[in-house]
């Protein structure tokens, strides 16, 4: 049978051939009458066999880390006879290890966050070195980690690459570390080789620091002309934190102001201070509010570094504007009799400088050749007024400061203009009548009615008679119907148009004034032939065919 | 898991050298006890190997080629290359890149192949 | 070189039946040096037996390998649809290394 020991060639040996066992058959005497063969895959390249003794020789240097074993098959052939002396047979070469790989990191570039402030022991990242070493051959790729760089803030466990925090950090010192972590095989053993890789350690941020006003004090002012939401001024707290954690509210402290309100401006976490309510020099001129600033998230769990909210005092100066008069009204509104005689007081206006320089005032009436205004404020009337032209004027009153004459106020002025009784009543219309020639007595030839240019406190009331020629004459009567209306009626039977074609009565129209008013209007009564019809709209008729030139029959 | 992907011409001209690259993907090139290889599929044809190469540089190639055959490594880039000189209609293929294991010879995984045409 | 010559060229069997692939060495070959791989048109060769009866990850039961020397077979107990297709051995016994002619199994 066949008889060897196991093989093993050591990799990496750069002799030209290397011994690294002897195949032989129990049945060779030692007389060279056998012939050895080696075949199969590296043989007679990698590997030869001394045809005579069996001996086998590597001849090529040899990489566990490539392949590690070789399956070949042996022959032995007697000489002699040609045949197999035994059976073909496969054996194994092993490639023995040693230790020529060094650690590397296959997983960098290696980096981690971890909160500052975390405690000992904290678990940052853990990093893997691989070793192509044979497992299973000594201690060539065990292997030891060690922090070349990085104490005292950080540990790393030597068998497992964990690294942790061994001391805490505060990000507002420094933010990030480099570690370096040496990996050593022949755990550690003189002869190890090393590899080293770097980790680059980032602290995040945890709201740890509050937010502290700079100045304990800022000076802000505000004009007095400023309106309502007015920015007047920034102030600012600063955070040593980042991000969220920096992110601030800005308030004023209870019951210091009701003038002004603070906003904050989440893009510069600055604190905006605005105008709450108009301020007025002259009532104050200076406010002192007191403003306080918080982080805006805060976890219950970091509070404790946030007991107490930074403050700061603001001082507001109000800056004087020189404002326009103040007149003691919005707007005036006086009346005045029509017909009074110019110059006659209509009212008085007032108006004041609200500075405290109070400069004089000087009137005007923009746009009146009606009245007139003086240095006080008093108001006259320039002309007569009439009320039935105009009953009320919309006028412009204007305040200007003596000593600036730029500062302007004007505010409306209505003037009503009051009824006297100055004008007496009058037919609304002109009136022209008929009559037929054989009207019979009380026929009602017209009703007449009456206008009043006066205006009536309470409602008008006229009265109308004939004058006293036209009452002696029989042929008419009027009859009032107490409604400011009044019937024309005959008086008599029959007319004659020869003798008697038109009649003028003299109508007297008064009114209810204090005192009454009367005019004297008159009414045209033409006589015309009306024929058996006896209607007037003949007569009508015939008028107009007449007054057109026509004669009929 | 590894994955292995080739790229290059599909068209080379007669005379020219091919060149193609795989990319070896979810996995390291450097590992130990793998050969990375090229394997060859005429049209309608058998498999052929070329050859295979270690990382660290050691090359094997199958004699009928080795004269016009070329495998280079590129582990920065986790790739390995063939070029094949003086090109005739002849090596119209598709050309497969393998993982091989060193100590056995199995080929796994495979690349899904690239049609190379050999033509002017 | 090892030639490696597959038999038969072409397996026409039907689903369900028994398939048996052959591959001869032309010189003796470690059985750990032989390995079987599956083709579909198409596609890369996939990787089905190593050792000569070594089954790969994910491959089902009815493929098995056996064999020693110069003469391997592949055994495809029951013939699913999906296993119609391309059969090749290959050794590593021996440089150059070589792959058989494959078994084209199709369905009858």
């Known amino acids: 049978g066949w008889v060897w020991n196991q093989f093993f060639v050591p990799e990496e040996m750069n002799t030209t051939s290397h011994h690294i066992g002897q195949l032989r058959s129990d049945l060779d005497n030692g007389n060279n009458s056998f012939q050895y063969k080696l075949l199969g895959a590296g043989a007679g390249s990698t590997f030869i066999i001394d045809e005579r003794t069996g001996d086998i020789y590597a001849i090529q240097k040899l990489d566990r880390e490539e392949r590690s074993l070789y399956i070949l098959r042996a022959q032995v052939i007697d000489i002699a006879t040609g045949r197999a002396v035994e059976p073909e047979s496969e054996f194994v070469i092993k490639v023995s290890d040693i230790n020529d790989n060094e650690p590397k990191f296959l997983d960098e570039p290696y980096e981690a966050i971890v909160p500052e402030m975390s405690p000992e022991g904290t678990l940052v990242i853990q990093v893997t070195a691989s070793d192509a070493d044979d497992p299973s051959s000594g201690n060539n790729a065990r292997l030891l980690y060690s922090l070349l760089q990085g104490q005292p803030y950080f540990s790393v466990e030597p068998t497992t690459g964990v690294i942790r925090i061994s001391s805490k950090m505060d990000r507002e010192l420094q933010d990030e570390y480099w570690v370096i972590i040496q990996a050593k095989d022949m755990i550690g053993q003189p002869g190890a080789l090393s590899g080293t890789t770097s980790v680059l350690i980032k602290l995040s941020d945890v709201n740890d620091n509050k937010p502290i006003f700079k100045e304990s004090l800022y000076r802000l002012t505000v004009s007095e002309s400023a309106p309502t939401g007015t920015s007047i001024g920034t102030i600012m707290a600063y955070d040593n934190d980042i991000g969220e954690n920096a992110e601030m509210d800005y308030s004023i402290e209870e019951d210091d102001s009701q003038t002004f309100d603070i906003i904050t401006n989440h893009e510069t976490q600055e604190g905006i201070v605005i105008l709450k309510k108009k301020v007025d020099f002259e009532h104050q001129n200076h406010y002192g509010i007191r403003a306080k600033v918080k982080n805006h998230h805060v976890p219950e769990q970091l509070m404790k570094y946030h007991t107490e909210a930074s403050t700061t005092f603001i001082k507001i100066q109000v800056e004087d504007v020189d404002e326009p008069p103040l007149f003691l009204l919005p707007y005036y509104v006086f009346e005045v009799f029509e017909e009074t005689p110019q110059g006659s007081f209509v009212g008085v206006v007032s108006a004041t400088d609200p500075d405290n320089r109070k400069s004089p005032i000087r009137y005007s009436i923009t746009r009146s050749k009606v009245f007139n205004i003086n240095d006080n404020g008093t108001i006259t009337t320039s002309n007569s007024l009439d009320r039935e032209i105009s009953a009320w004027y919309n006028l412009s009153i204007t305040a200007t400061e003596k000593y600036n004459i730029e500062q302007i106020s004007s505010i409306p002025l209505y003037v009503q203009v009051l009824n006297i009784n100055d004008h007496a009543p009058e037919f609304s219309q002109y009136y022209e009548t008929y009559v037929c020639e054989n009207a019979g007595s009380g026929q009602v030839i017209q009703t007449i009615s009456a206008v009043d240019r006066d205006e009536s406190i309470e409602e008008h009331h006229f009265y109308f008679n004939l004058s006293v020629e036209d009452t002696n004459n029989s042929s008419f009567t009027i009859i009032d119907n107490q409604d400011n209306t009044a019937v024309i009626l005959t008086n008599r039977t029959g007319f004659n148009l020869q003798e008697e074609p038109v009649f003028y009565i003299s109508i007297l129209i008064a009114d209810n004034g204090i005192p009454s008013l009367t005019s004297t209007n008159t009414l045209t009564i033409h006589v015309c032939d009306c024929g058996d019809s006896g209607s007037t709209q003949t007569c009508q008729y015939q008028e107009l065919v007449l007054s057109m030139g026509f004669k009929t029959e | 898991q590894v994955q292995l992907q080739e790229s290059g011409p599909g068209l080379v001209k007669p005379s020219q050298t091919l060149s193609l690259t795989c990319t070896v993907s979810g996995g390291s090139i450097s590992s130990g006890g793998y050969y990375w290889s090229w394997i060859r599929q005429h049209p309608g044809k058998g498999l052929e190997w070329i050859g295979y190469i270690f990382y660290r540089g050691r090359t094997y190639y199958n004699p009928s080629l080795k004269s016009r055959v070329t495998i280079s490594v590129d582990t920065s880039k986790n790739q390995f290359s063939l070029k094949l000189s003086s090109v005739t209609a002849a090596d119209t293929a598709v050309y497969y890149c393998?993982?091989?294991?060193?100590?056995?010879?199995?080929?796994?995984?495979w690349g899904q192949g690239t049609l190379v045409t050999v033509s002017s | 070189e090892i030639v490696l010559t597959q038999s038969p060229g072409t397996l026409s069997l039907s689903p369900g039946e028994r398939a048996t692939l052959s591959c001869r060495a032309s010189?003796?070959?470690?059985?750990?040096?032989l390995a079987w791989y599956q083709q579909k048109p198409g596609q890369a060769p996939r990787l089905l037996i190593y050792?000569?009866?070594n089954r790969a990850t994910g491959i089902p039961d009815r493929f098995s390998g056996s064999g020693s020397g110069t003469d391997f077979t592949l055994t495809i107990s029951r013939l699913e649809p999906e296993d119609f297709a391309v059969y090749y051995c290959?050794?590593?016994?021996?440089?150059?290394?070589?792959f058989g002619g494959g078994t084209k199994l199709e369905i009858k």
């Open positions: 050792g000569t009866s």
């Open positions: 010189q003796s070959v470690s059985s750990s040096y």
């Open positions: 393998a993982r091989v294991y060193s100590n056995y010879g199995w080929f796994d995984p």
């Open positions: 290959q050794q590593y016994g021996s440089s150059p290394l070589t």
